[in-house]
């Protein structure tokens, strides 16, 4: 009983429960393949508990192993469009600091208009995650079609 | 050592480890696009620890942020079938209470016969999740091809 | 404060935070559809904390409910290749002990060159997970395109 009370009194942050779910804000200007994200209760069902946004990119605040997940749906798309513009590719990676730059997760659309995946990966405080969408097709900004999130899993 | 013992004695429910994994029971009658789910050890590898089923739909028992995931495979399907019946779409949303009704996750099959995705979302006690499959194609009831689940992640 | 200190002193293993993320090592010889995995910090961003590898297959060390996830990308592939070689199918299952053999998750490539999915499933100490890729197409060994992992969720 005492333990349960103690647990409730501890701030969640000390338990390492960092988590974020973001919705698409906008795409980058020409020559910038990055997707720019936004999050917060005022925007709907997106949120940031621990991680932060830095110019639309997600910055990690706690070292650990994270589950990273993403879904991106193309807005003006059919299987014909997708194959004609193949390969439209989505890559999630650490883009800063430059010394830790690496691609973590990559998928092509081929003849589909949605990609969705997830993976476990170690991330460190200060890592900024970027999501690059190659090609010219526009992603949907519907919050149930395009989203990106991370969940702290363990140290 | 005392803490470890205390932790083991605490009921899991008090730690907020609500989790469910469901298998497809049946599709709805005409004009009802919902999929109806079932779960429990007698049925195989499906289970409900915390959430409950209400007429085949999943009802949440604990407030928090959840990881929601789903995979649906169409039973009599080829890439030709899928494109000819396009758009066959799967949407997961809160369907009751009506005041909280919202689509959480949506995917189209395009030229594929399986969709799979996951996302983080806040859910509240009493939220009922519905999974709507538009179109006339039949989903597979194989437990390794079609499943739906939630996992409590944090308050 | 005392609780927070006690928590930090507890080995993570006693909290049941078993987790693994693997990268593709090689495919099997003729008549062996299994993918063979490898993991460890020397190999990049893959790791095993709890589970172990047994001849390239993942063996579980702790009973519980796990989130299992996988992504496989085909290396020499286009939507035409994928459909011509259909059905190329990926199945994740318990392959040993034989008494517990079962398919947990199955997807076909249809006209795509990547599959990705995840599910919750109960696993027991000693369960070995195998990933079978039917057909003759070669999977990519790029670590951001093909990976397989598990995360302990609750007892």
């Amino acid at each position: 009983q005492r333990f349960a009370q103690a647990q409730q009194q501890l701030p969640l942050e000390s338990l390492g429960w960092d988590v974020a779910e973001l919705q698409l804000n906008h795409t980058g200007p020409q020559q910038d393949p990055r997707l720019y994200w936004q999050g917060g209760p005022a925007l709907g069902r997106s949120f940031l508990h621990g991680p932060e946004l830095d110019k639309g990119q997600l910055r990690i605040h706690r070292d650990g192993i994270y589950m990273v997940h993403i879904q991106v749906t193309l807005a003006i798309c059919s299987s014909t469009t997708a194959s004609r513009h193949h390969p439209t590719t989505l890559a999630v990676g650490i883009c800063s600091p430059a010394s830790r730059s690496i691609s973590l997760l990559r998928l092509s659309f081929h003849q589909g208009c949605t990609i969705a995946s997830q993976r476990l990966t170690p991330l460190a405080r200060g890592d900024t995650l970027c999501t690059n969408l190659t090609g010219t097709l526009l992603p949907s900004r519907n919050t149930d079609e395009t989203f990106f999130g991370v969940q702290w899993v363990r140290p | 050592q005392r803490f470890a013992q205390a932790q083991q004695q605490l009921p899991l429910e008090s730690l907020g480890w609500d989790v469910a994994e469901l298998q497809l029971n049946h599709t709805g009658p005409q004009q009802d696009p919902r999929l109806y789910w079932q779960g429990g050890p007698a049925l195989g590898r499906s289970f409900l620890h915390g959430p409950e089923l209400d007429k085949g739909q999943l009802r949440i028992h604990r407030d928090g942020i959840y990881m929601v995931h789903i995979q649906v495979t169409l039973a009599i399907c080829s890439s030709t079938t899928a494109s000819r019946h396009h758009p066959t779409t799967l949407a997961v949303g809160i369907c009751s209470p009506a005041s909280r009704s919202i689509s959480l996750l949506r995917l189209s099959f395009h030229q594929g016969c399986t969709i799979a995705s996951q996302r983080l979302t806040p859910l509240a006690r009493g939220d009922t999740l519905c999974t709507n499959l538009t179109g006339t194609l039949l989903p597979s009831r194989n437990t390794d091809e079609t499943f739906f689940g939630v996992q409590w992640v944090r308050p | 404060q005392r609780f927070a200190q006690a928590q930090q002193q507890l080995p993570l293993e006693s909290l049941g935070w078993d987790v693994a993320e693997l990268q593709l090592n090689h495919t099997g010889p003729q008549q062996d559809p299994r993918l063979y995995w490898q993991g460890g910090p020397a190999l990049g961003r893959s790791f095993l904390h709890g589970p172990e590898l047994d001849k390239g297959q993942l063996r579980i060390h702790r009973d519980g409910i796990y989130m299992v996830h996988i992504q496989v990308t085909l290396a020499i592939c286009s939507s035409t290749t994928a459909s011509r070689h259909h059905p190329t199918t990926l199945a994740v299952g318990i392959c040993s002990p034989a008494s517990r053999s079962i398919s947990l998750l199955r997807l076909s490539f249809h006209q795509g060159c990547t599959i990705a999915s995840q599910r919750l499933t109960p696993l027991a100490r000693g369960d070995t997970l195998c990933t079978n890729l039917t057909g003759t197409l070669l999977p990519s060994r790029n670590t951001d395109e093909t990976f397989f992992g598990v995360q302990w969720v609750r007892p």
Epitope: S108, G135 | - | H26, P29, A75, C77, L138, S140
Partner: antibody
């Protein structure tokens, strides 16, 4: 030093068969996918076939599917290409090539090639 | 099926000069493009992969750029041993086609 040495080329009549070999050294042969690539006189390079490191998976260009079979013997560090029902358009220099670790078909090492001539 | 078109077919350059070779894909290949050098009677040699990454042992006068459909191989200062035929190859989809080459000859 990585070395790939092809052999088995020669003159064959249309409809005939030939078996090419490629002896590999200087790397862990069984760890890498391998391909055959051909170059017709005065023409472009053309990918023919690929095989996984273990030998359990193989892929072919449409132009040779059903006629050619790629195989390997990892105990002998040797790659093979069995060519049946040969046609005039199969005339080319055949190279064996080592894939990058990723299994993607770009080739960091090539053999010197062996000439196959299909003519009556 | 993706078609790669190389231009020019022949490029006449003096030693020490810069050479710029082009490869255009019929549809986007992302960055899945490699460049090879082939001298008469020899096998091709990998120069660049991933559009811009130099292969092991390749001098830094060779550089690759581009993504999507337009790619360039640049040789900053031509050495006598650089006169050869250069091929581009797409490897992101099946089949993995090659271009038909650009011959770099001494002016």
């Amino acid at each position: 030093e990585v070395q790939l040495l092809e052999s088995g080329g020669g003159l064959v009549q249309p409809g005939g068969s030939l078996r090419l070999s490629c002896a590999a050294s200087g790397f862990t042969f069984s760890s890498y996918a391998m391909s055959w690539v051909r170059q017709s006189p005065g023409k472009c390079l053309e990918w023919v076939s690929a095989i996984s490191g273990s030998g359990g998976r193989a892929q072919y260009a449409e132009s040779v599917q059903g006629r050619f079979t790629v195989s390997r013997d990892n105990s002998k560090n040797t790659l093979y290409l069995q060519m049946n029902s040969l046609r005039a358009e199969d005339t080319a220099v055949y190279y064996c090539a080592k894939h990058d670790y990723s299994n993607y078909p770009y080739f960091d090492y090539w053999g010197q090639g062996t000439l196959v001539t299909v003519s009556s | 099926e993706i078609v790669l078109t190389q231009s020019p077919a022949t490029l006449s350059v003096s030693p020490g000069e810069r050479a710029t070779l082009s490869c255009r894909a019929s549809q986007s290949v992302s960055s899945n493009l490699a460049w090879y050098q082939q001298k008469p009677g020899q096998a091709p040699r990998l120069l660049i992969y991933g559009s811009s990454s130099r292969a092991t042992g390749i001098p830094d006068r060779f550089s690759g750029s581009g993504s999507g459909t337009d790619f360039t191989l640049t040789i900053s200062r031509l050495e006598p041993e650089d006169f050869a035929v250069y091929y581009c190859q797409q490897y992101g989809s099946s089949p993995p086609p090659f271009g038909c080459g650009t011959k770099v000859e001494i002016k």
